[in-house]
């Protein structure tokens, strides 16, 4: 005759408030004759959770039909879980006896704990923009989870980061916990289109982690490079000078032309283009009138980018005799 085993496969069962918990219990033998009862806790003060034959247990239902002959599944479902339901649940076999039934064997127990999902991670970047080669900090926060064990990872464009510090609070027992992590990220010039991702894995998420993202475009400032060039061809009595502002981000930019130190108010032609890496190029054309009296014209292209100190590039205009005499309307 096979010895009776009480099998409770789950050591830990995480449940959410308001949901239904299923507690599994199977037996390996029909003998000895007697009922299987469910208790929470051990000892004389243990709480009766379910007795098929008597008592009132409106929140409990059986998974299978206990009245069927040869039934060996004594699993139960408990509805509308509340924090008061946490504890260790035991299915216990009794042997019929007189005057009382006698406890014969208990299952190893299943601990029911309240599981709460973490909130969607929120990633916050630095308050001010920083230039490439510098380090910026990003914080990630998620709240309201239980149990305390949680895993947090950082990624930049899919590559895992290692320079971060994480804290889970509180350190002691609590109904729910919070996680806060700070990652240090070195900015690259091409990071305008980059993302940092904070990924949170928790037992309640069943292998489907939560992610929070931040765009490095919010944190980076790529300062422009300036180049001022004079077009070789003259248009009538005008020379075309070009100021090329390259590889800057964000788009916020003010450009002014100065002629021999005097700011020019007149309209200039310009174009803005976006590069593949998300930075911008700005090209501005300035037409300078040429006269015999103006041999030493110095042009300055001044750029103020994203509220930073202005940078400028100068060009001393070269007006050859040949250029002065030329009168054809050639296009630059």
């Amino acid at each position: 005759e096979e010895e009776l085993q009480m099998i409770q496969p789950e050591k830990l069962l995480l449940v959410t408030v308001g949901k239904t918990a299923t507690l599994h219990c199977t037996v390996t033998s029909l003998l000895p004759v007697g009922p299987v009862l469910w208790f929470r806790g051990v000892g004389p003060g243990r709480e009766l959770i379910y007795n098929q034959k008597e008592g009132h247990f409106p929140r409990v239902t059986t998974v299978s039909d206990l009245t069927k002959r040869n039934n060996m599944d004594f699993s139960i479902r408990i509805s509308s879980i509340t924090p008061a339901d946490v504890g260790t649940y035991y299915c216990v076999k009794f042997r019929k006896g007189s005057p009382e039934n006698v406890e014969f064997k208990s299952g190893p127990g299943t601990e029911m704990a309240l599981g709460a999902k973490p909130s969607a991670p929120v990633v916050l970047g630095p308050a001010a923009r920083t230039t490439p080669e510098h380090t910026v900090s990003f914080t990630c926060e998620s709240h309201g989870f239980s149990p305390r064990d949680i895993t947090l990872k950082w990624f930049k464009n899919g590559n895992e980061l290692s320079d971060f510090q994480t804290n889970v609070d509180p350190t002691g027992q609590s109904v729910a916990y919070s996680i806060r992590s700070t990652a240090r990220v070195v900015l690259d010039p091409w990071d305008v289109r980059s993302q940092v991702i904070c990924e949170v894995a928790h037992v309640t998420l069943q292998g489907d982690p939560l992610r929070g993202t931040a765009n490095l475009s919010e944190a980076i400032r790529v300062p422009p490079t300036l180049e001022v060039t004079q077009q070789p061809m003259r248009v009538g009595n005008q020379v075309n000078v070009t100021c090329q502002v390259r590889k800057f981000y964000p788009q916020s930019l003010q450009l002014t032309w100065s002629e021999n130190g005097n700011v020019c108010q007149r309209e200039t032609a310009s174009t803005l283009t976006e590069n593949k890496d998300g930075t911008y190029n700005w090209t501005s054309w300035f037409l300078v009138n040429i006269s015999d009296q103006r041999d030493d014209v110095v042009l300055t292209c001044q750029v103020k980018h994203d509220g930073q100190l202005a940078v400028s590039k100068r060009l001393a205009l070269e007006v050859t005799v040949h250029q002065k005499d030329q009168s054809s309307d050639a296009t630059p």
Epitope: K53, T67, K96
Partner: antibody
Framework: EVQLVQSGAEVKKPGATVKISCKAS????????MHWVQQAPGKGLEWIGR????????KYAPKFQGRVTITADTSTNTAYMELSSLRSEDTAVYYC??????WGQGTLVTVSS | EIVLTQSPATLSLSPGERATLSCSAS???????LYWYQQKPGQAPKLWIY???NLASGIPARFSGSGSGTDYTLTISSLEPEDFAVYYC?????????FGQGTKLEIK
């Protein structure tokens, strides 16, 4: 819907035997213990005993042991309580109940010479 | 056997008042096995509170139950006219199962 319908009132002479029935509907009596409770006029409730209709196992209160027999017929979904050697103090309303939660309407047994 | 003693035997109160009914056991009863029933004249008892503190279906929230070991209490926070009845505590922790003698809650 769970319902327990008991047999009608009985008048018995001292020394006689009475058998009360409790017909269940809305559930199978095999799945529950069926209890019997006595309530003498103006008095409180007293547990008489119970049966497990699945295997006919019974438990009785010492006060009624030897005079009471609880039986069940699973084919008709009915529980019975038989009390013998009746005396005047057995005059009471007798209730059947399913697993302590659902009660029958009661059966008045009057023992009088 | 476990003897359950209810006190007081009769409690005379007015609607709106708070009622406290006690049930004392001669030996310890697990709270899972302590039930309360309400009975009105000419009616069968009705399960009122199960496992010491859980209200049966449809029982108003003004009722509450508490206790452990040998001392149990049924409390009605503010009496309504329909609450006047007899209340019995009941243990089914060990055979023979027993009831208290009842507390009659009557209108003052």
């Amino acid at each position: 819907e769970v319902q327990l319908v008991q047999s009608g009132a009985e008048v018995k002479k001292p020394g006689a035997t009475v058998k009360i029935s409790c017909k269940a509907s809305g559930f199978n009596i095999k799945d529950y213990y069926m209890h019997w409770v006595q309530q003498a006029p103006g008095k409180g409730l007293e547990w008489i005993g119970r049966i497990d209709p699945e295997d006919a196992e019974t438990k009785y209160a010492p006060k009624f042991q030897g005079r009471v027999t609880i039986t069940a017929d699973t084919s008709t979904n009915t529980a019975y309580m038989e009390l013998s050697s009746l005396r005047s103090e057995d005059t009471a309303v007798y209730y059947c109940d399913r697993g302590l939660a659902y009660w029958g309407q009661g059966t008045l047994v009057t023992v009088s010479s | 056997e476990i003897v359950l003693t209810q006190s007081p035997a009769t409690l005379s109160l007015s609607p709106g008042e708070r009622a406290t009914l006690s049930c004392s056991a001669s030996s310890s009863v697990s709270s899972s096995y302590l039930y309360w029933y309400q009975q009105k004249p000419g009616q069968a008892p009705k399960l009122w509170i199960y496992s010491t503190s859980n209200l049966a279906s449809g029982i108003p929230a003004r009722f509450s139950g508490s206790g452990s070991g040998t001392d149990y209490t049924l409390t009605i926070s503010s009496l309504e006219p329909e609450d006047f009845a007899v209340y019995y505590c009941h243990q089914w922790s060990s055979y023979p199962y027993t009831f208290g003698q009842g507390t009659k809650l009557e209108i003052k």
